[in-house]
Protein backbone atom coordinates (compact mmCIF):
# COMPACT_ATOMS: atom_id res chain seq x y z
CA UNK A 1 0.00 0.00 0.00
CA UNK A 2 1.20 3.12 -0.72
CA UNK A 3 1.52 5.45 2.43
CA UNK A 4 3.53 8.76 1.34
CA UNK A 5 2.33 12.30 0.59
CA UNK A 6 4.18 14.33 -2.05
CA UNK A 7 4.83 18.49 -0.91
CA UNK A 8 5.54 20.63 -3.75
CA UNK A 9 5.98 24.53 -4.25
CA UNK A 10 2.31 24.37 -5.08
CA UNK A 11 1.41 27.19 -7.61
CA UNK A 12 4.50 29.64 -8.15
CA UNK A 13 5.32 32.73 -9.97
CA UNK A 14 8.21 34.28 -11.05
CA UNK A 15 9.76 37.13 -13.38
CA UNK A 16 10.74 36.75 -16.72
CA UNK A 17 14.68 36.43 -17.14
CA UNK A 18 14.68 35.41 -13.77
CA UNK A 19 14.89 31.45 -12.20
CA UNK A 20 13.02 29.55 -10.17
CA UNK A 21 13.52 26.60 -8.14
CA UNK A 22 11.27 23.33 -8.37
CA UNK A 23 11.27 21.45 -5.38
CA UNK A 24 9.40 18.68 -4.43
CA UNK A 25 9.46 16.14 -0.95
CA UNK A 26 8.25 12.91 -0.59
CA UNK A 27 7.38 11.89 2.92
CA UNK A 28 5.49 9.89 5.25
CA UNK A 29 6.94 6.59 3.35
CA UNK A 30 9.91 4.17 3.98
CA UNK A 31 10.45 3.34 0.28
CA UNK A 32 13.81 4.05 -1.18
CA UNK A 33 13.42 6.48 -3.83
CA UNK A 34 15.26 4.92 -6.59
CA UNK A 35 14.61 7.99 -9.39
CA UNK A 36 12.90 11.34 -10.17
CA UNK A 37 11.81 12.68 -13.55
CA UNK A 38 10.94 15.95 -14.31
CA UNK A 39 8.54 16.93 -16.97
CA UNK A 40 6.33 19.46 -18.54
CA UNK A 41 2.95 18.41 -20.49
CA UNK A 42 4.57 15.83 -23.14
CA UNK A 43 8.27 17.00 -22.81
CA UNK A 44 11.64 15.86 -20.22
CA UNK A 45 13.29 18.10 -18.39
CA UNK A 46 15.53 15.94 -16.66
CA UNK A 47 16.00 12.46 -14.80
CA UNK A 48 17.93 11.76 -11.46
CA UNK A 49 18.74 8.53 -11.07
CA UNK A 50 20.27 7.66 -8.04
CA UNK A 51 22.96 5.18 -9.22
CA UNK A 52 23.65 6.62 -12.89
CA UNK A 53 23.25 10.58 -11.91
CA UNK A 54 21.49 13.24 -14.04
CA UNK A 55 20.10 13.40 -17.52
CA UNK A 56 19.04 16.65 -18.64
CA UNK A 57 17.22 17.00 -21.86
CA UNK A 58 19.17 19.03 -24.89
CA UNK A 59 16.12 21.29 -25.08
CA UNK A 60 16.75 22.79 -21.81
CA UNK A 61 20.52 22.08 -21.11
CA UNK A 62 21.73 25.59 -21.76
CA UNK A 63 18.79 26.90 -18.73
CA UNK A 64 18.17 24.16 -16.51
CA UNK A 65 20.34 23.31 -13.16
CA UNK A 66 20.29 19.92 -11.52
CA UNK A 67 19.40 21.02 -7.48
CA UNK A 68 19.03 21.55 -5.16
CA UNK A 69 18.68 17.99 -3.88
CA UNK A 70 16.51 16.30 -6.18
CA UNK A 71 14.66 19.49 -7.49
CA UNK A 72 15.76 21.41 -10.23
CA UNK A 73 16.43 25.01 -10.68
CA UNK A 74 14.60 26.64 -14.51
CA UNK A 75 16.97 29.89 -15.73
CA UNK A 76 16.42 32.62 -17.98
CA UNK A 77 12.30 32.02 -17.47
CA UNK A 78 10.27 32.79 -20.88
CA UNK A 79 6.55 33.38 -20.42
CA UNK A 80 6.34 30.13 -22.77
CA UNK A 81 7.95 28.28 -20.26
CA UNK A 82 4.64 28.88 -18.17
CA UNK A 83 2.94 25.77 -17.17
CA UNK A 84 2.18 22.41 -15.50
CA UNK A 85 5.45 20.85 -14.39
CA UNK A 86 5.46 17.12 -12.61
CA UNK A 87 7.66 15.39 -10.08
CA UNK A 88 7.72 11.78 -11.19
CA UNK A 89 9.25 9.85 -8.29
CA UNK A 90 9.90 6.00 -8.57
CA UNK A 91 10.34 4.36 -5.38
CA UNK A 92 11.39 0.91 -4.35
CA UNK A 93 8.45 -1.05 -3.21
CA UNK A 94 5.75 1.47 -3.46
CA UNK A 95 5.84 2.08 -7.15
CA UNK A 96 5.49 5.72 -8.49
CA UNK A 97 4.47 9.19 -6.84
CA UNK A 98 3.56 12.38 -8.73
CA UNK A 99 3.75 16.11 -7.84
CA UNK A 100 2.40 18.96 -9.41
CA UNK A 101 3.78 22.18 -9.52
CA UNK A 102 2.03 25.05 -11.92
CA UNK A 103 4.55 27.94 -12.67
CA UNK A 104 3.23 31.25 -14.40
CA UNK A 105 5.88 33.86 -15.76
CA UNK A 106 5.40 37.23 -15.48
CA UNK A 107 6.36 40.04 -17.48
CA UNK A 108 5.83 42.15 -14.53
CA UNK A 109 8.61 42.48 -11.52
CA UNK A 110 5.37 41.24 -8.83
CA UNK A 111 5.75 37.60 -8.90
CA UNK A 112 5.32 35.85 -5.79
CA UNK A 113 5.37 32.73 -4.06
CA UNK A 114 2.16 30.41 -4.05
CA UNK A 115 1.44 28.46 -0.72
CA UNK A 116 2.74 24.97 -0.07
CA UNK A 117 0.55 21.76 -0.45
CA UNK A 118 0.08 18.43 -0.51
CA UNK A 119 -0.83 15.87 -3.18
CA UNK A 120 -1.41 12.47 -1.18
CA UNK B 1 40.22 10.21 -29.45
CA UNK B 2 37.74 8.61 -27.16
CA UNK B 3 38.62 4.44 -26.94
CA UNK B 4 36.98 1.93 -25.37
CA UNK B 5 38.89 -1.25 -25.10
CA UNK B 6 37.74 -4.42 -23.90
CA UNK B 7 39.48 -7.94 -23.15
CA UNK B 8 39.51 -10.78 -25.01
CA UNK B 9 37.43 -13.27 -25.85
CA UNK B 10 36.48 -16.06 -23.68
CA UNK B 11 35.93 -19.73 -23.46
CA UNK B 12 34.43 -20.96 -19.71
CA UNK B 13 32.83 -23.76 -18.01
CA UNK B 14 29.25 -23.81 -16.19
CA UNK B 15 29.45 -22.84 -12.87
CA UNK B 16 32.90 -20.79 -13.21
CA UNK B 17 33.15 -17.11 -12.97
CA UNK B 18 34.23 -14.33 -15.50
CA UNK B 19 35.62 -10.65 -15.03
CA UNK B 20 35.83 -8.56 -18.34
CA UNK B 21 37.73 -5.18 -18.42
CA UNK B 22 36.77 -1.97 -20.48
CA UNK B 23 39.88 0.32 -20.19
CA UNK B 24 39.10 3.48 -21.12
CA UNK B 25 41.20 6.34 -22.93
CA UNK B 26 40.86 9.70 -24.58
CA UNK B 27 37.96 11.78 -21.81
CA UNK B 28 38.28 11.82 -18.02
CA UNK B 29 37.02 8.56 -16.78
CA UNK B 30 34.80 10.18 -13.56
CA UNK B 31 32.61 12.37 -15.71
CA UNK B 32 30.85 9.67 -17.57
CA UNK B 33 28.78 6.60 -16.49
CA UNK B 34 30.26 2.96 -18.07
CA UNK B 35 27.30 0.57 -18.98
CA UNK B 36 27.11 -2.99 -19.91
CA UNK B 37 24.94 -4.31 -22.52
CA UNK B 38 24.38 -7.75 -23.49
CA UNK B 39 24.11 -9.24 -26.75
CA UNK B 40 22.95 -13.16 -27.32
CA UNK B 41 24.03 -14.43 -30.85
CA UNK B 42 21.65 -13.36 -33.46
CA UNK B 43 19.56 -11.70 -30.60
CA UNK B 44 18.32 -8.13 -29.37
CA UNK B 45 20.40 -6.24 -26.87
CA UNK B 46 19.66 -6.00 -23.09
CA UNK B 47 20.80 -3.53 -20.78
CA UNK B 48 22.31 -4.91 -17.70
CA UNK B 49 23.59 -1.67 -15.38
CA UNK B 50 25.43 1.03 -14.97
CA UNK B 51 28.18 2.60 -12.93
CA UNK B 52 28.88 6.11 -11.83
CA UNK B 53 32.88 6.12 -11.31
CA UNK B 54 32.05 9.68 -9.20
CA UNK B 55 30.02 7.28 -7.04
CA UNK B 56 32.97 4.41 -7.11
CA UNK B 57 31.73 1.43 -5.05
CA UNK B 58 30.24 -1.57 -6.56
CA UNK B 59 27.14 -2.12 -7.75
CA UNK B 60 25.45 -5.84 -8.13
CA UNK B 61 23.12 -6.44 -10.92
CA UNK B 62 21.46 -9.85 -10.72
CA UNK B 63 24.47 -12.00 -11.42
CA UNK B 64 26.76 -9.11 -12.64
CA UNK B 65 29.26 -6.90 -9.88
CA UNK B 66 30.23 -3.86 -12.00
CA UNK B 67 33.15 -2.21 -10.67
CA UNK B 68 35.90 0.46 -11.36
CA UNK B 69 39.61 1.41 -11.01
CA UNK B 70 39.86 5.24 -10.99
CA UNK B 71 43.36 4.99 -11.12
CA UNK B 72 43.86 3.03 -14.75
CA UNK B 73 40.34 4.40 -16.06
CA UNK B 74 38.87 0.84 -16.14
CA UNK B 75 35.67 -0.38 -15.94
CA UNK B 76 35.11 -4.13 -14.75
CA UNK B 77 32.32 -6.82 -15.37
CA UNK B 78 32.30 -10.12 -13.23
CA UNK B 79 29.95 -12.72 -14.09
CA UNK B 80 28.92 -15.35 -11.32
CA UNK B 81 28.09 -19.01 -11.55
CA UNK B 82 27.41 -19.14 -15.45
CA UNK B 83 25.45 -20.95 -17.38
CA UNK B 84 24.80 -21.70 -21.08
CA UNK B 85 22.66 -18.85 -21.30
CA UNK B 86 25.06 -16.55 -20.37
CA UNK B 87 26.84 -17.08 -23.37
CA UNK B 88 26.93 -14.01 -25.75
CA UNK B 89 28.76 -10.40 -26.31
CA UNK B 90 29.36 -8.00 -23.99
CA UNK B 91 29.65 -4.53 -24.56
CA UNK B 92 30.64 -1.74 -22.06
CA UNK B 93 29.79 1.60 -23.45
CA UNK B 94 29.64 5.31 -21.93
CA UNK B 95 26.82 7.58 -21.42
CA UNK B 96 27.40 11.19 -21.65
CA UNK B 97 27.66 14.18 -19.53
CA UNK B 98 23.93 15.10 -17.94
CA UNK B 99 23.23 12.92 -21.07
CA UNK B 100 21.98 9.24 -20.87
CA UNK B 101 22.39 8.32 -24.16
CA UNK B 102 24.91 5.78 -24.57
CA UNK B 103 27.52 7.40 -27.09
CA UNK B 104 30.90 5.01 -27.43
CA UNK B 105 30.91 1.80 -27.17
CA UNK B 106 33.82 -0.65 -26.93
CA UNK B 107 34.36 -3.52 -29.15
CA UNK B 108 32.56 -6.48 -27.43
CA UNK B 109 33.85 -9.48 -25.47
CA UNK B 110 32.77 -12.47 -26.78
CA UNK B 111 31.60 -14.96 -23.74
CA UNK B 112 31.24 -18.92 -24.44
CA UNK B 113 29.92 -20.92 -21.60
CA UNK B 114 30.49 -24.63 -22.33
CA UNK B 115 31.84 -28.00 -20.80
CA UNK C 1 9.77 -3.22 -17.14
CA UNK C 2 8.51 -1.24 -20.21
CA UNK C 3 8.50 -3.16 -23.49
CA UNK C 4 9.73 -1.31 -26.35
CA UNK C 5 8.12 -3.27 -29.48
CA UNK C 6 9.43 -3.24 -32.95
CA UNK C 7 6.63 -4.13 -34.67
CA UNK C 8 9.04 -5.05 -38.13
CA UNK C 9 11.41 -7.40 -37.49
CA UNK C 10 12.82 -7.07 -41.28
CA UNK C 11 12.12 -3.86 -43.54
CA UNK C 12 13.33 -4.32 -47.26
CA UNK C 13 13.97 -0.71 -49.12
CA UNK C 14 15.73 0.74 -52.14
CA UNK C 15 18.59 3.30 -52.24
CA UNK C 16 16.62 6.42 -52.10
CA UNK C 17 14.10 5.39 -50.94
CA UNK C 18 12.39 7.31 -47.58
CA UNK C 19 12.11 4.39 -44.86
CA UNK C 20 10.24 5.07 -41.43
CA UNK C 21 11.07 2.32 -38.56
CA UNK C 22 8.33 2.51 -35.65
CA UNK C 23 8.68 1.35 -31.69
CA UNK C 24 6.31 1.60 -29.66
CA UNK C 25 6.71 1.77 -25.61
CA UNK C 26 4.43 -0.57 -23.02
CA UNK C 27 4.00 2.81 -21.13
CA UNK C 28 4.57 6.50 -21.25
CA UNK C 29 8.29 7.17 -21.31
CA UNK C 30 8.13 11.13 -22.44
CA UNK C 31 11.21 11.75 -24.75
CA UNK C 32 13.71 9.38 -23.19
CA UNK C 33 14.03 7.18 -26.14
CA UNK C 34 17.36 6.65 -28.42
CA UNK C 35 18.08 4.97 -31.59
CA UNK C 36 21.51 2.70 -32.39
CA UNK C 37 22.50 0.89 -35.86
CA UNK C 38 24.63 -2.22 -35.43
CA UNK C 39 26.32 -3.42 -38.66
CA UNK C 40 27.14 -6.60 -39.20
CA UNK C 41 30.21 -7.60 -36.75
CA UNK C 42 29.83 -4.14 -35.55
CA UNK C 43 29.23 -2.46 -32.22
CA UNK C 44 26.00 0.12 -31.78
CA UNK C 45 26.29 3.22 -33.21
CA UNK C 46 24.47 6.24 -31.92
CA UNK C 47 22.20 7.76 -34.32
CA UNK C 48 19.36 10.07 -32.52
CA UNK C 49 18.65 10.55 -28.88
CA UNK C 50 15.98 12.34 -27.08
CA UNK C 51 13.75 10.84 -29.33
CA UNK C 52 14.64 13.21 -31.98
CA UNK C 53 17.79 15.04 -31.51
CA UNK C 54 20.65 13.82 -34.48
CA UNK C 55 23.87 12.52 -33.06
CA UNK C 56 27.35 14.20 -34.98
CA UNK C 57 27.34 13.47 -38.70
CA UNK C 58 23.85 11.83 -38.98
CA UNK C 59 22.08 14.07 -41.41
CA UNK C 60 20.03 11.62 -43.82
CA UNK C 61 18.14 10.29 -39.84
CA UNK C 62 15.61 11.97 -38.06
CA UNK C 63 13.45 10.93 -35.01
CA UNK C 64 10.10 11.96 -33.48
CA UNK C 65 7.97 11.08 -30.84
CA UNK C 66 7.22 11.38 -27.39
CA UNK C 67 5.04 9.28 -25.04
CA UNK C 68 4.62 5.74 -26.06
CA UNK C 69 4.87 6.04 -30.18
CA UNK C 70 8.28 6.56 -31.93
CA UNK C 71 9.74 6.85 -35.10
CA UNK C 72 12.81 6.48 -36.69
CA UNK C 73 13.21 7.51 -40.49
CA UNK C 74 15.87 7.41 -43.24
CA UNK C 75 15.47 10.57 -45.72
CA UNK C 76 17.36 9.04 -48.59
CA UNK C 77 18.49 5.27 -47.86
CA UNK C 78 22.10 4.33 -48.99
CA UNK C 79 24.01 0.65 -49.69
CA UNK C 80 26.13 1.72 -46.57
CA UNK C 81 22.44 1.86 -44.36
CA UNK C 82 22.29 -2.06 -44.50
CA UNK C 83 21.90 -2.75 -40.62
CA UNK C 84 19.84 -3.42 -38.03
CA UNK C 85 18.20 -0.83 -36.06
CA UNK C 86 17.60 -0.41 -32.47
CA UNK C 87 15.11 1.77 -29.91
CA UNK C 88 15.62 2.11 -26.64
CA UNK C 89 14.47 3.65 -23.46
CA UNK C 90 15.87 4.88 -20.99
CA UNK C 91 13.08 6.78 -18.85
CA UNK C 92 13.26 4.07 -15.67
CA UNK C 93 15.74 1.59 -15.07
CA UNK C 94 15.98 -1.16 -16.40
CA UNK C 95 16.79 0.07 -19.42
CA UNK C 96 15.13 -1.90 -22.22
CA UNK C 97 15.53 -2.07 -25.91
CA UNK C 98 13.70 -3.16 -28.82
CA UNK C 99 13.84 -6.51 -30.67
CA UNK C 100 15.15 -4.53 -33.37
CA UNK C 101 14.40 -3.99 -37.50
CA UNK C 102 17.15 -4.88 -39.84
CA UNK C 103 17.02 -2.88 -43.34
CA UNK C 104 17.27 -4.97 -46.38
CA UNK C 105 18.71 -2.85 -49.02
CA UNK C 106 17.06 -5.05 -52.64
Known amino acids: MMTGTIETTGNISAEKGGSIILQCHLSSTTAQVTQVNWEQQDQLLAICNADLGWHISPSFKDRVAPGPGLGLTLQSLTVNDTGEYFCIYHTYPDGTYTGRIFLEVLESSVAEHGARFQIP | EVQLQQSGPELVKPGASLKISCKTS????????MHWVKQSHGKSLEWIGGINPNNGGTKFKGKATLTVDKSSSTAYMELRSLTSEDSAVYYC????????????WGQGTSVTVSS | DIVMTQSHKFMSTSVGDRVSITCKAS??????VVWYQQKPGQSPKLLIY??SYRYTGVDRFTGSGSGTDFTFTISSVQAEDLAVYYC?????????FGGGTKLEIK
Open chain 3, 50 to 51: SA
Open chain 3, 27 to 32: QHVSTA
Open chain 3, 88 to 96: QQHYITPWT
Open chain 2, 26 to 33: GYTFTEYT
Open chain 2, 93 to 104: ARSGNWDYAMDY
